[in-house]
Interface confidence: low
């Protein structure tokens, strides 16, 4: 009943709670003297389903048979309509449509930790749409039973609040869950288990790692576990990896030696526990321990290259370059590089520690045989030194690689190809391809890049430190014992026409011809490798086509003579520059009048 129902009653048969698909009879009847005031036959009783009229009848009572009610709750309300007045609510009723509970499935119980309590879960099956009571029963040895109820419509979990103890770990316990509502009841199949089956240990805690003598090869992982734990699983991985290494250990008693860790690497460690070899379940993984392994002395050898520059008749400048060791080779933080320079015949040697750089420059006499050794040092020791004899890398003409070419290969890559030297190609021990940004004036501060290539290779793809629209000076060295030959070429990964032409800074007269001097185009405006300069000239105030002279680009050249100008004629001159992609705009214009005699 949904209100006081002072004026009448609504009855529902067979019940307020019905099985889905059933029919109900709803009767609305007025109490004596509760009809319309003047004339009772004018009583009009109306039955509403929620707020929609479904039936009406004149008189003291109304019968209605209702079918097809949906799952859930439906509200019926009976109202009285009298002439010249609003409808009056008489009474109402809620009808609950549902189904009997299905048999609960997959009943499983667990006790989290040796001190935890037994809790069970199950699958309810389809929703009953009715108030359903679940009773969970646990029976154990010595006729002990425990019972817990839950009256939640969605109940699928109950905690007994009792703790199973390991006194008799093989004793059997049986759990069963029963669901009951107004339309029926159903029980799960019994689930039988022992202490060892259902206790899921707590994850290990207080995880620590120790490195004996600060060595990665003597590493022990420690943790704490509940008392009955028999098995542990360890998993660990470098922090930047997605793949775990797994180890299973028995009777570890809270410690395990790890033998395969890499030095100077941050690792993540987790541990899980189990009480029995084949019974029960694994604990959750522990919290992660993150720890960095100690350093070990570097392995591997530095890749060292060098450059020689003539200073004067007695001195030369040597610039050494080397590449960082990989993380796996450095095995720690590299604190410094040790460079040793030695004159081989006289035995003089100097050693220097370099920090913060991967290059070193010094001046040595042009006489004598010189060698260098470079090694990397961390807190545990040094790498094996890389030894190089300083030689004239381009001295042996017969060792010079032939037909060197450099072609753009996609974004920011250059493919360098060559042919083996004329001299017996089998004499070549390795090729070195070297590249650096082309700077007029040969700036020695420009970073040097190189890669080594096996003697049977005749190409190399260079991609490190390659930028678009920049011209690179590329050299290919063929090395054989203490001899070397080289060839060079200019190359770029991407080019377009230069943004500006050269700036003519002077025109001077020399014996009936002129010498034009210009400033180089700024590197950032060259837009790749320059192939040619063009010098244009025409008579001032003339509409004729200008004449031109095309000069192959050479890095160091910034002047050129022209001897085809007529004396005492004023000319306008300008210059452009060309890459493979096209010609620049004009540089500045200069006027000049040759003063010399006519031919």
């Amino acid at each position: 009943k949904i209100d006081a129902c002072k004026r009448g009653d609504v009855t529902v048969k067979p019940s307020h709670v019905i099985l889905l698909g059933s029919t109900v009879n709803i009767t609305c009847s007025l109490k004596p003297r509760q009809g319309c005031f003047h004339y009772s036959r004018r009583n009009k009783l109306i039955l509403y389903k929620f707020d929609r009229r479904i039936n009406f009848h004149h008189g003291h009572s109304l019968n209605s048979q209702v079918t097809g009610l949906p799952l859930g709750t439906t509200l019926f309300v009976c109202k009285l309509a009298c002439i010249n007045s609003d409808e009056i609510q008489i009474c109402g009723a809620e009808i609950f449509v549902g189904v009997a509970p299905e048999q609960p499935q997959n009943l499983s119980c667990i006790q989290k930790g040796e001190q935890g309590t037994v809790a069970c879960t199950w699958e309810r099956g389809r929703d009953t749409h009715l108030y359903t009571e679940y009773t969970l029963q646990l029976s154990g040895p010595k006729n002990l039973t425990w019972q817990k109820q839950c009256k939640d419509i969605y109940c699928d979990y109950l905690d007994f609040g009792i703790n199973l103890t390991p006194e008799s770990p093989e004793s059997n316990f049986t759990a069963k869950v029963t669901a009951v509502n107004s339309l029926g009841s159903s029980s799960s199949l019994p689930s039988t288990f022992t202490f060892l089956d259902i206790v899921r240990p707590l994850p290990p805690w207080d995880i620590r790692i120790k490195f004996q003598k600060a060595s990665v090869s003597r590493c022990t992982l420690y943790w704490r576990d509940e008392g009955l734990v028999l098995l542990n699983r360890l998993r660990y991985r470098p922090s930047n990896s997605r793949l775990w290494n797994m180890v299973n250990v028995t009777k570890a008693k809270g410690r395990h030696d790890l033998l395969d860790l890499k030095p100077f690497t941050e690792y993540e460690f987790q541990i899980s526990s189990k009480l029995h070899l084949y019974k029960g379940s694994w604990s959750d993984w522990s919290e992660s321990l993150r720890a960095q392994t100690p350093e070990e002395e570097p392995t591997g050898m530095l890749d060292v290259w060098y450059m020689k520059r003539h200073i004067d008749y007695s001195r030369q400048q040597i610039s050494l370059f080397w590449k960082n060791l990989s993380v796996s080779e450095a095995r720690g933080k590299i604190l410094h590089y040790q460079v040793t320079l030695q004159e081989l015949t006289g035995g003089k040697a100097m050693t220097q520690n370099i920090t913060g750089h991967t290059s070193w420059t010094t001046v040595i006499p042009r006489t004598g045989n010189w060698a260098v050794a470079v090694s990397a040092a961390n807190s545990k020791g040094s790498s094996l030194p890389t030894r190089i004899n300083i030689m004239n890398l381009c001295e042996a003409g017969l060792l010079a690689p032939r037909q060197v070419s450099a072609n753009s290969e996609g974004m920011d890559n250059i493919l360098v190809t060559w042919q083996p030297p004329r001299k017996d190609p089998s004499a070549v021990q390795e090729y070195v391809v070297e590249w650096r940004e082309l700077h007029p004036g040969g700036d020695t501060q420009v970073p040097l890049n190189w890669l080594r290539s096996r003697p049977y290779n005749v190409s190399a793809l260079i991609s490190e430190n390659i930028k678009s629209y920049i011209c690179y000076e590329i050299r290919v060295y063929a090395l054989s014992g203490d001899q070397g030959g080289c060839s060079s070429i200019l190359g770029n990964s991407k080019h377009k026409a230069p943004l500006s032409g050269p700036h003519i800074n002077a025109i001077t007269e020399e014996k009936g011809s002129i010498l034009i001097s210009w400033n180089s185009i700024p590197v950032q405006e060259q837009m790749g490798c320059l192939l040619h300069y063009r010098i244009y000239w025409k008579e001032r105030d003339s509409n004729s086509q200008p004449q031109l002279c095309e000069i192959p680009y050479r890095v160091s050249q910034n002047s050129h003579p022209i001897n085809s100008l007529q004396p005492r004629v004023t000319y306008v001159l300008w210059m452009t520059a060309l890459t493979a992609a096209g010609e620049s705009s004009h540089g500045n214009e200069r006027e000049f009048c040759l003063q010399g005699k006519a031919n």
Epitope: P203, W205, D206, I207, R208, E287, S288, L289, R290, A291
Partner: nanobody, 127 residues
Amino acid sequence: EVQLVESGGRLVQAGDSLRLSCAASGRTFTSYRMGWFRQAPGKEREFVSALRWSSGNIDYTYYADSVKGRFSISGDYAKNTVYLQMNSLKAEDTAVYYCAASTRWGVMESDTEYTSWGQGTQVTVSS
């Protein structure tokens, strides 16, 4: 490196309540712990309370005997924030309260086990 910022400290009367917050930013992990320590003038820093996150849930809380039953630690993993609810405050609770975080798992109340520290927030309880 985890950065920690405490807030909520102020002057209160004995018997009052106060809630401190500690927000963590930077490199945070799915498994680590956060705790509160305090240092009264002229005294050593002492442990107050700590909790452990495990995969986003708090699976363990721990209190110093002197605050048990009066202080409560909680956290919001989504916000990387830990709170210290302090009830029935006493004059002896006056101190600078520091938030600390650790990715190591050792003794909870040992300040050497914590790798990151906040600047501290002053709590003064007047009687």
